[in-house]
Amino acid sequence: SEVEYRAEVGQNAYLPCFYTPAAPGNLVPVCWGKGACPVFECGNVVLRTDERDVNYWTSRYWLNGDFRKGDVSLTIENVTLADSGIYCCRIQIPGIMNDEKFNLKLVIKPAKVTPAPTRQRDFTAAFPRMLTTRGHGPAETQTLGSLPDINLTQISTLANELRDSRLANDLRDSGATIRIG
């Protein structure tokens, strides 16, 4: 089952996906697609990187983080209800059947008629490594928690642990890190 992420109509949506390059600049091809991950690659590709750069993208989809450090989280600009659905992040680690693939479910909610300011809770003690999105207009104001690095064997249980956690709502924009090499 997919981990669920939420955004409101008109906001920017954030779908986390990370890996740790084996060495600085030693990048791994990554693709993002609309729809669940197929057997290989991505379906309906919205963005892809190669060993050097972002080499394919479509409008409204971009990488806000430092992809050269393995932050390949996808930002979708000014979302509409049509952006709801499953997204695939595929990290194409070289080798025999080494790909890591993640299906992320994006739920778009109608915009609030009278948005009230919400109090941000401080989770710095529990998750000291915080990642705040860079400003791209007033729509994107949330603070995003970045989980500590974990190894591959922990990936599969991460989603369930988060979903069952009392912090799940506050951490729904958190991403796991894959360490390569």
Epitope: A36, V39, F40, N44, Y56, G95, M97, N98
Partner: antibody
């Protein structure tokens, strides 16, 4: 015109080895994933292996992963399948096929004419 | 492995008829289903991908439909050149698997 031409098939003894080649033309070979698919004498189709455009990522059917090796030479526009420890279940016509992937992964949009492999005891 | 159960195995038809071939996946495969046509002595030729998108040059009488686990290939107004074997394939998860085929024959 897209062309895929397999070669290297033949009669081989049980436990023997064979190397298949697929010469590609009419498209930018290095811009496509490539696959091997086989068709048994009973006409069943079975995916065997796939390799990414750069050759960096490789995928195998479980029953062949320790015996077959898929590779490619983008400079020569050629795809290969090295087969070893062959058994009777490997008897089939082997096709190479092209897999577009860049904006949308699509499996096997062009196929070669096939090369026949017969494993005899 | 995901099993693609294709029915029927054989189908007799006449020119001008409308025929349907179905494939049922043993697990959810979204719309990651392709259809191929194979004429005797030839290699398979792609017809449909993403369950319903026709490949370039494929006549409009071939239509694919379905999602999840149930998929259909329909040939409306069958022509003599359509007499062939048809295979479905899922490409949702590894290994990529094919149906056993449906042979379309003349009555």
């Amino acid at each position: 015109e897209v062309m895929l031409m397999e070669s290297g098939g033949g009669l081989v003894k049980l436990g023997g080895s064979l190397k298949l080649s697929c010469a590609a033309s009419g498209f930018t070979f290095s811009s496509y994933y490539m696959s091997w698919v086989r068709q048994t004498p009973e006409k069943r189709l079975e995916w065997v292996a796939t390799i990414s455009n750069s050759g960096g990522s490789i995928y195998y059917l479980d029953s062949v992963k320790d015996r077959f090796t898929i590779s490619r030479d983008n400079a020569k526009n050629t795809l290969y399948l090295q087969m070893s420890s062959l058994n009777s279940e490997d008897t089939a016509v082997y096709y190479c096929a092209r897999d577009p992937y860049y904006s949308n992964y699509v499996p096997m949009d062009y196929w070669g004419q096939g090369t026949s492999v017969t494993v005899s005891s | 492995s995901i099993v693609m159960t294709q029915t029927p195995k054989f189908m007799s038809t006449s020119v001008g008829d409308r025929v349907s071939v179905t494939c049922k996946a043993s697990q959810y495969v979204d719309t990651y289903v392709a259809w191929y046509q194979q004429k005797p002595g030839q290699s398979p030729k792609p017809l449909i991908y993403s369950a319903s998108t026709r490949h370039t040059g494929v006549p409009a009488r071939f239509t694919g439909s379905g999602s999840g686990t149930d998929f259909t290939l329909t040939i409306s107004n069958v022509q003599s050149e359509d007499l062939a074997e048809y295979f479905c394939a899922q490409y949702s998860s590894s290994p990529l698997t094919f149906g056993a085929g449906t042979k379309l024959e003349l009555k």
